[in-house]
Interface confidence: low
């Protein structure tokens, strides 16, 4: 039989909690084996004091018997031929020799029934507090600060941590981020970064990245000073920030122990984030103006935000929804956050001019309206903050109310009317459609433009397929022309002001279908961009190619 | 107002799967940890598993372990229990909880519940 | 597993005390007032009470049971009451609850 106890001496510090273990081998008997401990005092070396028994509920001296009661000095088993006991505070009495013994179940003494050792208590000199965050300055006060840094920008603080225990004993200083009002100590005390007794730093779960990133430092400063940088504060940073210090020291089986933990707040950290700042407005109010005049709105971005810079930077669009129109609408212009401009989809060919004004003032401008252009606009402002490195990530985005913006209508209407020349047409001829059109309303210098399309029945039915674009002419004169069915010649032309032809020369039988007009009505602004002002579709125009008598 | 909004429940077949959707509004998910509870009837509240604020520490409740899958989206505010190889016993109305701390793991520490979607699993 | 009673009764304006022994440092209570329904947080983290919850409630802690108190019991207050604590293995737990009868 042999009993096993950890090498000694064991070096503990006062108040805080030990364990030592002790386990049994080659015993007989049950597997489930009893353990007595006993405490041998430096002042009574040969005296005993009954400490706690696995068997014997009565078994503590009286020194011992209310702290076993209450709890604090326990015997727990971890198997039948193992136990440790626990003491929770330990008390500068409590050093000197530890017998682990056990009774007997073998049929003959052999080997050793008891193990031995020597536990010496440490005084409690492990002191925490919380340092200015320079390398030098006055102690902090004796309350926790209360600090507010915005989103973005820089989170330092510092810690004083120190020990004068006589042994040879390593700290590890670790700081901590608790949610507000949260216990000092809970299970919810999140680690940022520590630095290990071997110097080594490392972070917590979330916060690993930002470390390996570089945007979350520790150094220690000196002998007892420790430094925690926390660059691009985020939402998620704010709470109650602690440190903790815990001194280790090496038992003689060459295993670490921990033996004192002391911990302080530091501040209490308000992060002001730039959602909860950000703030858009826009003017004049309600526009109403006529086509070809220039609209131009203002866009305002206010809060108690940092200036774009290092830590920030903003970007500001506006985006258009037609009346009527769910959603925020598409984009018309931006400025980024390196303050280049930029026209969104279906605005470039534009005379617009997106441009900063005044420090947090932009301005949209559009050189001539059209009545597309009427809808509700909002400015749109983004705030980033540059990350690690320089790498911005977007913290907030805030949009204007809408601004309504009426533009009149032309108040144009057309009407078309088309045909086929002759009635009746046979392959191998030409077929000659024509299109009359009528114009009411519109401003002076209004252009017509008109194009052919055709839909082709299949299996006898007119397909699903979209129309398909024949020819046409532009507003601009300039003959377009697109894809015939028969494949041959095609040609498109204006045979008086409001009257347009389209000719399909030699007709085949692939060139049978139902014809249709589009015009369109268009008028040219001060900036030389057109805009279409109306439309209208002509009724159905039916080619059918027939097959001459002597055709085989 | 903080809000949770369970949705996913309904009529599933043993052997199969469901995935169970919690929708926070009025409150950044990302700084709690959110759980999972469910009560079949007439019994009491049943822990069924917990996910950290960051996701990378979950727990599950030893009925469900090997089954279920806790999971979110901070940026969409969401949580989902995913829980496969349905069984009767796992009737009931299920509550999405959020606590008040983050990585805590603990049914101590909850400070609001969803209204609950009802789960029945039946052939 | 967390112990508490099955069943206390009380008079109207009496006080109650619901009690769960467990092994963690940590519980909370919920009141439903029918199966199916919400639960509702009375408190959390031993003695934390929310904003919206009457000062009637409060709970305590000593040792390893955690107690709730209600004084001035009202007839509304008739409800399940559970207990919630996390186990040895940090996995959530709730009591069976206890049903509130009032007289």
């Known amino acids: 039989r042999e009993v096993l106890v950890p090498e000694g001496p064991l070096y503990r510090v006062a108040g805080t909690a030990v364990s030592i273990s002790c386990n049994v081998t080659g015993y007989e008997g049950p597997a489930q084996q009893n353990f007595e401990w006993f405490l041998y005092r430096p002042e009574a070396p040969d005296t005993a004091l009954g400490i706690v028994s696995t068997k014997d509920t009565q078994f503590s001296y009286a020194v011992f018997k209310s702290r076993v009661v209450a709890g604090e000095v326990q015997v727990q088993r971890l198997q039948g031929d193992a136990v440790v006991l626990k003491i929770a505070r330990l008390q500068a009495q409590d050093a000197g020799i530890y017998e682990c013994h056990t009774p007997s179940t073998d049929t003959r003494y052999l080997g050793s029934y008891s193990g031995k050792v020597e536990l010496r208590v440490l005084p409690d000199v492990l002191q925490v507090s919380a340092a200015p965050p320079g390398p030098r300055g006055r102690q902090a006060p004796t309350s926790p600060p209360r600090m507010t840094v915005h989103e973005g920008q820089e989170l330092a603080l510092g810690c004083l941590a120190r020990t004068s225990t006589q042994k040879h004993t390593h700290l590890a200083v670790s700081f901590g981020r608790s949610v507000p009002e949260a216990p000092v100590g809970r299970s919810t005390l999140q680690e940022v970064v520590g630095i290990r007794s071997d110097l080594a730093v490392e972070a917590g779960a979330p916060y690993a990245e930002r470390l390996a990133a570089g945007e979350l430092r520790l150094g220690k400063e000196g002998t007892d000073r420790y430094r925690m940088v926390v660059g691009g504060a985020q939402a998620g940073d704010a709470g109650t920030y602690h440190c903790t210090a815990a001194e280790w020291i090496q038992d003689p089986d060459g295993s670490w122990a921990q033996i004192a933990e002391k911990r302080a707040v530091l501040a209490h950290v308000d992060v002001q984030t730039l959602s909860s700042q950000l703030a858009v407005t826009v003017g004049p109010g309600e526009r109403r103006i006529g086509p070809g005049e220039p609209l131009e709105l203002l866009c305002n971005v206010s809060g108690a935000l940092p200036p774009a810079g290092r830590h920030a930077a903003y970007s500001v669009g506006w985006e258009m929804a037609p009346a009527g129109a769910p959603g925020p609408g598409r984009l018309v212009a931006q400025l980024d956050t390196e303050g280049v401009g930029s026209l969104g989809p279906g605005y470039e060919g534009r005379h617009i001019a997106m441009e900063k004004v005044a420090s947090r003032t932009y301005r949209l401008r559009l050189e001539a309206a059209r009545p597309g252009d009427a809808g509700t606009y909002r400015c749109l402002a983004k705030a980033y903050v540059r990350g690690s490195g320089t790498r911005l990530r977007e913290a907030a985005s805030a949009r204007s109310r809408p601004l309504p913006v009426h533009v009149r209508e032309e108040g144009v209407v057309l009407e078309a009317v088309a045909w086929l020349a002759g009635g009746t047409v046979y392959r191998g001829e030409t077929a000659s459609l024509l299109c009359n059109i009528s114009v009411r309303g519109g401003p002076p210098g209004l252009r017509l433009a008109a194009s052919w399309w055709v839909e082709r029945p299949e299996d006898g039915e007119l397909s699903s397929v979209p129309a398909q674009l024949v020819g046409g002419v532009g507003q601009d004169g300039v003959a377009e022309l697109g894809v015939r069915p028969g494949g041959g010649p095609v040609s498109v032309e204006l045979v008086g002001p409001r009257s347009h032809r389209l000719r399909l020369h030699s007709l085949g039988p692939e060139d049978e279908g139902v014809y249709h007009c589009a015009p369109s009505a268009w008028v040219q602004h001060a900036d030389y961009s057109w805009y279409q002002a109306g439309s209208a579709r002509s009724g159905p125009v039916t080619v059918y190619p027939y097959m001459h008598a002597l055709d085989t | 107002a903080v809000t949770l909004d369970e949705s996913g429940g309904g009529l599933q077949t043993p052997g199969g799967g469901l995935s169970l959707v919690c929708k926070a509004s009025g409150f950044s998910i990302s700084s709690y940890e959110m759980q999972w509870v469910r009560q079949a009837p007439g019994k009491g509240l049943e822990w069924v598993a917990g996910i950290d604020d960051d996701g990378s520490s979950r727990a599950y409740a030893p009925a469900v372990k090997g089954r279920a899958t806790i999971s979110r989206d901070n940026g969409q505010s969401t949580v989902r229990l995913q829980l496969n190889n349905l069984r009767a016993e796992d009737t009931g109305t299920y509550y999405c909880?959020?606590?008040?701390?983050?990585?805590?793991?603990?049914?101590?520490?909850?400070?609001?519940w969803g209204h609950g979607t009802e789960v029945i699993v039946s052939s | 597993a967390l112990t508490q009673p099955s069943s206390v009764s009380a008079n109207p304006g009496e006080t109650v005390k619901i009690t769960c022994s467990g092994d963690d440092r940590w519980y909370g209570w919920y009141q439903q007032k029918s199966p199916g329904s919400a639960p509702v947080t009375l408190i959390?983290?031993?003695?934390k009470r929310p904003s919206d919850i009457p000062s009637r409630f409060s709970g305590s802690k000593s040792g390893s049971t955690g107690t709730l108190t209600i004084t001035g019991v009202q007839a509304d207050d008739e409800a399940v009451y559970f207990c919630g604590s996390r186990d040895s293995s940090y996995a959530g737990i709730f009591g069976a609850g206890t049903t509130l009868t009032v007289l």
């Open positions: 909880a959020k606590t008040i701390y983050a990585a805590t793991l603990n049914a101590g520490e909850i400070d609001a």
């Open positions: 959390y983290s031993n003695d």
